[in-house]
Every structure is written in structure tokens, then in C-alpha cells.
Amino acid sequence: LEVQVPEDPVVALVGTDATLCCSFSPEPGFSLAQLNLIWQLTDTKQLVHSFAEGQDQGSAYANRTALFPDLLAQGNASLRLQRVRVADEGSFTCFVSIRDFGSAAVSLQVAAPYSKPSMTLEPNKDLRPGDTVTITCSSYQGYPEAEVFWQDGQGVPLTGNVTTSQMANEQGLFDVHSILRVVLGANGTYSCLVRNPVLQQDAHSSVTITPQRSPTGAVEVQVPEDPVVALVGTDATLRCSFSPEPGFSLAQLNLIWQLTDTKQLVHSFTEGRDQGSAYANRTALFPDLLAQGNASLRLQRVRVADEGSFTCFVSIRDFGSAAVSLQVAAPYSKPSMTLEPNKDLRPGDTVTITCSSYRGYPEAEVFWQDGQGVPLTGNVTTSQMANEQGLFDVHSVLRVVLGANGTYSCLVRNPVLQQDAHGSVTITGQPMTFPPEA
């Protein structure tokens, strides 16, 4: 009896479901009562699942396996393995007995994508050319072990003085830490690339060091190239799409949205069903559009903490993923202006003008200018403080010596929204009180 399995390993993402394909050619008049089907681990011979005496005997493998009962009669002896774990990796043998006997082994290769690497420097301040610096590149929760590559700004590989360690957690997923020791030149860019050899997925980050200053990063899945900008408190749509084939069925679809860096699950659609939000119940898919290839995610009541990269994983017959960035923004309020002192002002007095604008995001750019539009850059101190929601209050202080009269304007710019909020104060030359009395 000829039993057919794929030659290549079946690659499955941790936490998703995998199908170990196995088929045989039923003869005319074949009946399930004739079938003995056994799935077992090739090496240990541990029973995984079986079908005998015309009945599915069920899973012997942590209740995470299932056959395709409606397809058995057509010769489809495939095994569905749910919620794949690293420990599942290995060879599974499919034994089929009807009149004759046949078997074949299929390999399961488990994989998990690595997060975008984070980069740290030691020391990270007062750097000068000639200093030796240690750059650490860390990427998390991937499998199997990663390949790590370093290169400079010109793409030249850096192989000397690299130490890489990989540690598996309880789930068998690896955290990789790679350390590069370099002697700084006048300036330099250092890139770390963490490659998942199974997924052929590259995660990379780079750091540019300018000494004497603190360093300051198979299914075609389509997402917007530009970040999605969303106002705090509004709803955002993270667009993701794929091209369904004729006859595409939602039962074939595995869709996973997760945070790119931490791999935290955000939302999923598997086994023909919306599995719901795993992200504070603030996410939703567009169920009526999934069959047309629209895998977009709706994120409700956006918060500052939502900012970052979200990855859309789509698995049908093949697998594909793409990441979309969410840029959160909040407009700054119209600045309020205060003077200190604010009465009996005379030409020649030094006055402190404070410009305050509230509850914006991200951090603002603040500009001062006089009545003629000439920038005022000296004696300006600006502070920005985030509240519990991550929104910034900005306070900018200008110290000036009063002339005969003068107008002082403060402009608070939100760099993402390209929104300018401005306030101004006019101080006349004669003795005066601020605000002017009616």
C-alpha cells in the first residue's frame, strides 16, 4: 500500500495549528471499516492518534490532535495538530493498513518569529572616537535558534569580537543576546540582523553612534508602508490583505495579529471562527470581508501605549506575514501664556514668560519668536512631562529684557499631526500690569 506524505518538513508557528498531510489511494468499494490508521512518534513509537474498527479512537497526544473524518474515505489520513509547541517538533509516522500495509514519516518543523531586536550601548554617554563600546542586540521568543549577523553602515560584515548566547525558556523559545565590541571611529552605524533559518525571517535593528553626543530604530500579505496615524481615543484600522484563491474557505484560514516586538497575541481567527480579542477587548476583525481577503484589524479607543508595530500573519495553504506601524497622536491645546512678574512692568525689566500646552502626543517642538517673526532661541527652557495616559504637558519658559514694547509668540508643534498651536503676549513700553486692566 502506497502511503504519501510531503517530502519537505511541515513548518508550523508556535501556537498555531499544523496539518501533517498523509494520504493513501483507496481502492474501489473501500470502506472505513477496513481501515486501520495509526499516527505515532517515529522515534519513541508513542501513539499520537488512531482510527480503527470504523471509528476515530481519538487523540493520545494531550488532546491536541484530530483527523479529518469527512476526508478519510477519499484517502486523506492527515492529522491536525493544534496549538503547536516546540516540544512537538520531530518526525511523525503515518501507518495505514487496509488489506495491505504501508507507512511513511513526515517531519514537523516548529518555528516562531523573532522580535525586532532591541539595541543597548555600554557606556552610552560621553563617547569619544577611540573609545571601546559594547553594543548588545537582543531578540526574543523565536524558534529555532537564530543566526545573528552584524554589519557596519556600508554593509560590511563585522565578525570579530562578537559573542552570541541563546537561552531557551520553559516553552522552548529562544531569547538571543549578541554582543559586539567595537572601537569607535568618528561616527558609525552598527546593524544587527537576527535570522530565523526556518522562516527565512530577518529582524534587524541598527544604532548610529556619533561620538561626543549621546547615541540616539508564501501568501503575499499586504500592509500599508506608511504608519497608520490615530488620534488618542479614536478607532484605528490596521489594514492587512491577502489574495484568496478560487473556492477559498474560511475553514482554511489561520489569521493571527500580534505585537511585533513582544509577540503578544492581539487577535486571531482560526478553525473557521473568530477567536476574539486578546488585547483588552478593544480589537475586532471585519468578518464579512475576510472571505474577500481583508484581514484588517480595528483597534478601538486608541491609547498611547498602543503605539508600535503590529504583525499580521496569514496562513492558508502557505504562510505570509507583514508588519504595520501604528503611530499614536494627540493634538496640543492652545497655549496659555503667563508673565512673572506680571505688574508694574517697565522697559529694562527682566520678565519670565511661560507658555503651557497640554495633553499632546508625541513630544512637541516649541518655537519662540518676536513680533517681527525673528526666532528667539536664547534663554529658553522647555520641559515636557507625560501623565498616566502617556500624554505630554509642555511648559516652555522664555526670559527676556523688556524693550519699549514687544510681542512674544510661542508655537507648539505636534510633529506627527503637523499641527501648530500658538499663543502670544504683547507687552507695551509704559508701566503696565499684566493682564491689562479693563
Partner: antibody, heavy 119, light 109 residues
């Protein structure tokens, strides 16, 4: 052998709703395959209208999406094409056909039923 | 919506070879268009021949084959027989739906 048979009213008035039935014998519509509606206008032009797959997933021709729905009765082995409002331009011969998932051919066709929309 | 174009009519002799093509208004036809070929004989008898560019439906004679030729999908009838005298429609998949061509009348005489 698999057989598909289309049935419908034959003559309807404009703006009326309409339901056509495709009865499948010899195969379970929940086992596999995707089940299509296709129509042929006078003059021979064919138009693919949509399908319902074995698990109930629908896909429709965008030009018809808001006017039709495809549903099924699994216990009777039937699937249906429903129009919410017909026009004279819906006069055509309507066919159902089985599509093979992964190979994408239409391997079995119903014999078709002629629908005339006229006041 | 995309427009799919076929030759209106082709003629061949018994035993001859005829190639029908299917062009897309949106550009080159690729395997992602899952080209489909359907035969219609008198009395509206339809038979599916080819799906997914080149997958022959069960029971379809091997003289029918599907392929991509240049930027078009093609149906080749090699060793045509008189019973192949029929109308042939191609359909191309555009992400969520099929669009049929106008059909090619093949005469075998």
C-alpha cells in the same frame, strides 16, 4: 454519480424577489468543493455570480454583491441563489456548478433553468 | 471590472491542433488568475475542462491541455476530433471573483 439540478419560477416581474434552487445528488455539499452559480445571458455571455464553500463561506461577484445571497440547506443537499429585487437585465439561463478546491475546475454542471423577468 | 478577451472563432481539421487564448485587460495572465476553461455544446450542455491554468478535470481527454503562452492563458486541443466542435469559454480569477471571456467557437471540419 454526482448530479446537480436547478429549479426556479421561470417568469417573474421586475422588482420581485426570487429564489433559485440547486439540488445536489450523489455528494454532500458539506464534504468538500465549492458550489457556484453562473448565468448565461441571451447572446451567450457568461457571468460568474458567486459560490458557497463546503463550510459555508461565501464569495460574490462585486457587481452583484448587494443584490444576491447564496445560502444552503445541508440536510436537503441544496443551495440557493436569492435576489432581493430583479430587473429585466436579470433575464438569463441560470446554472449551478461544482468547483474543485485546489484544482479549480468546474467538474459538474446543472442543466440550467431559464428565467424571464418581464412585467 | 476586468475584461477577458477570446478569439471569436477558430477552425481546424480533424486531427489538427488548435490553440485558444485568453487575454486580460489588466495585464499579463499569471497562475494567480487560475485560468478556467469550459466547453458548451448545443442545448446548453456545459463541461469543465481545465482549472488552475493546467489542471485537467476528471474524464477530460488528454488532447485538451491548459497553459500560459506569453501574457495569455491558452487551451490547446491536440488532435482535434469532430465532437470537439463547440463553444469554449475561459474564466480568469481576479482576487475575489471570476470573469468569463466572450467565448471562442471552434469548428472542426
Amino acid at each position: 454519480d454526482v448530479q446537480l439540478q436547478v429549479s426556479g419560477p421561470g417568469l417573474v416581474k421586475p422588482s420581485q424577489s426570487l429564489s433559485l434552487t440547486c439540488s445536489v445528488a450523489g455528494y454532500s455539499i458539506t464534504s468538500d468543493y465549492y458550489w457556484n452559480w453562473i448565468r448565461q445571458f441571451p447572446g451567450n455571455k457568461l457571468e460568474w455570480m458567486g459560490y458557497i464553500s463546503y463550510d459555508g463561506t461565501n464569495n460574490y461577484n462585486p457587481s452583484l454583491k448587494n443584490r444576491i445571497s447564496i445560502t444552503r440547506d445541508t440536510s436537503k443537499g441544496q443551495f440557493f441563489l436569492k435576489f432581493n429585487s430583479v430587473t429585466t437585465e436579470d433575464t438569463a439561463t441560470y446554472y449551478c456548478a461544482r468547483g474543485k478546491d485546489g484544482s479549480y475546475y468546474f467538474d459538474y454542471w446543472g442543466q440550467g433553468t431559464t428565467l424571464t423577468v418581464s412585467s | 471590472q476586468a475584461v477577458v478577451t477570446q478569439e471569436s472563432a477558430l477552425t481546424t481539421s480533424p486531427g489538427g491542433t488548435v490553440i485558444l487564448t485568453c487575454r486580460s485587460s489588466t495585464g499579463a495572465v499569471t497562475t494567480s488568475n487560475y485560468a478556467n476553461w469550459v466547453q458548451e455544446k448545443p442545448d446548453h450542455l456545459f463541461t469543465g475542462l481545465i482549472g488552475g491554468t493546467s489542471n485537467r478535470a476528471p474524464g477530460v481527454p488528454v488532447r485538451f491541455s491548459g497553459s500560459l503562452i506569453g501574457d495569455k492563458a491558452a487551451l490547446t486541443i491536440t488532435g482535434a476530433q469532430t465532437e470537439d466542435d463547440a463553444m469554449y469559454f475561459c474564466a480568469l480569477w481576479y482576487r475575489t471573483h471570476y470573469v468569463f471571456g466572450g467565448g471562442t467557437m471552434v469548428t472542426v471540419l
